[in-house]
């Protein structure tokens, strides 16, 4: 049935950058400035997506495909598509709806992005603190006693950090 | 169609006020954050302002805090800035900004930007 319906229906014959016109007898029109058709048999073609504001355009709008944007310097991209851009903050920072704000003692962001997160603690892997933490690093922990022992490894890397986000407020 | 458009933007004196507006259409204005946000010539992008959906929460960059005030107008789909006391380094393009949904619970991004509209102080 389908293949039927291809052979009868002469917009399946529309390539992609034009529209099906019904107003000319179904005849394959190219797509007005500003907008496009990604695939073919269309019978209208989409608005090309602006990027307006902090947007702005990776890849400009062709017949055949739409925009594509990011942010200015300042902002980043959020969501698919960078369908929204969100303030940048400095390290040692955190994003609230208040604004960008230092992180709390005993947490730390080194990205320009995410939440302030815990400094780890050294002890519930029995190591001591090695170099204290700040609001922009995490605390470097150093051997435990037992590791002192000659040939063991000094300092263990701080455990490896979450993936940004945003907590709610 | 989705829609921000500023305006009120000007040429005005250090001390001077400017009153900026953004007229929304194409969604419910009522149901979002809206934020301010701004670009100096040659710097990075700053966030200026925000306000929630009903107008009782109000947050503003340190630069601006006690000379520049956020408002809006749900019955008429409209967002303002009142700028007081303007100093040369307010001088930017200035953009009015819908808060993406989510805005506030998951997130800080802003969906939709108007074109701007251009502050300059100068003497």
């Known amino acids: 049935f389908e293949r039927t319906r291809s052979l009868q229906d002469p917009c399946s014959n529309c390539p992609a950058g034009t529209f099906c016109d019904n107003n000319r007898n179904q005849i394959c029109s190219p797509c007005p400035p500003n907008s496009f058709s990604s695939a073919g048999g269309q019978r209208t073609c989409d608005i090309c997506r602006q990027c307006k504001g902090v947007f702005r355009t990776r890849k400009e709008c062709s017949s055949t495909s739409n925009a594509e944007c990011d942010c200015t310097p300042g902002f980043h991209c959020l969501g698919a598509g960078c369908s929204m851009c969100e303030q940048d903050c400095k390290q040692g920072q955190e994003l609230t709806k208040k604004g960008c704000k230092d992180c709390c003692f005993g947490t730390f962001n080194d990205q320009k992005r995410g939440i302030c997160r815990p400094w780890t603690n050294c002890s519930l892997d029995g190591k001591s603190v090695l170099v204290n933490g700040t609001k922009e690093r995490d605390v470097v922990c150093g051997p435990s006693p037992a590791d002192l022992s000659p040939g063991a490894s000094s300092v263990t890397p701080p455990a490896p950090a979450r993936e940004p986000g945003h907590s709610p407020q | 169609e989705v829609q921000l458009v500023e305006s009120g933007g000007g040429l005005v004196q250090p001390g001077g006020s400017l009153r900026l507006s953004c007229a929304a259409s194409?969604?419910?204005?009522?149901?979002?954050?809206m934020n301010w946000v701004r670009q100096a010539p040659g710097k990075e992008a700053e966030w200026v302002a925000n306000?929630?959906?009903?107008?009782?929460?109000?947050y503003y960059v340190d630069s601006v805090q006690g000379r520049h005030t956020i408002s809006r107008d749900n019955a008429k789909n409209s967002l303002f800035l009142e700028m007081n006391s303007l100093r040369v380094e307010d001088t930017a393009l200035y953009y009015c900004?819908?808060?993406?949904?989510?805005?506030?619970?998951?997130?800080?991004?802003?969906?939709?930007w108007g074109q701007g509209t251009t502050v300059t102080v100068s003497s």
């Open positions: 900004a819908r808060g993406g949904p989510g805005y506030g619970d998951l997130h800080y991004g802003m969906d939709v």
């Open positions: 194409g969604f419910t204005f009522r149901s979002y954050w």
């Open positions: 306000i929630n959906p009903d107008g009782s929460e109000k």
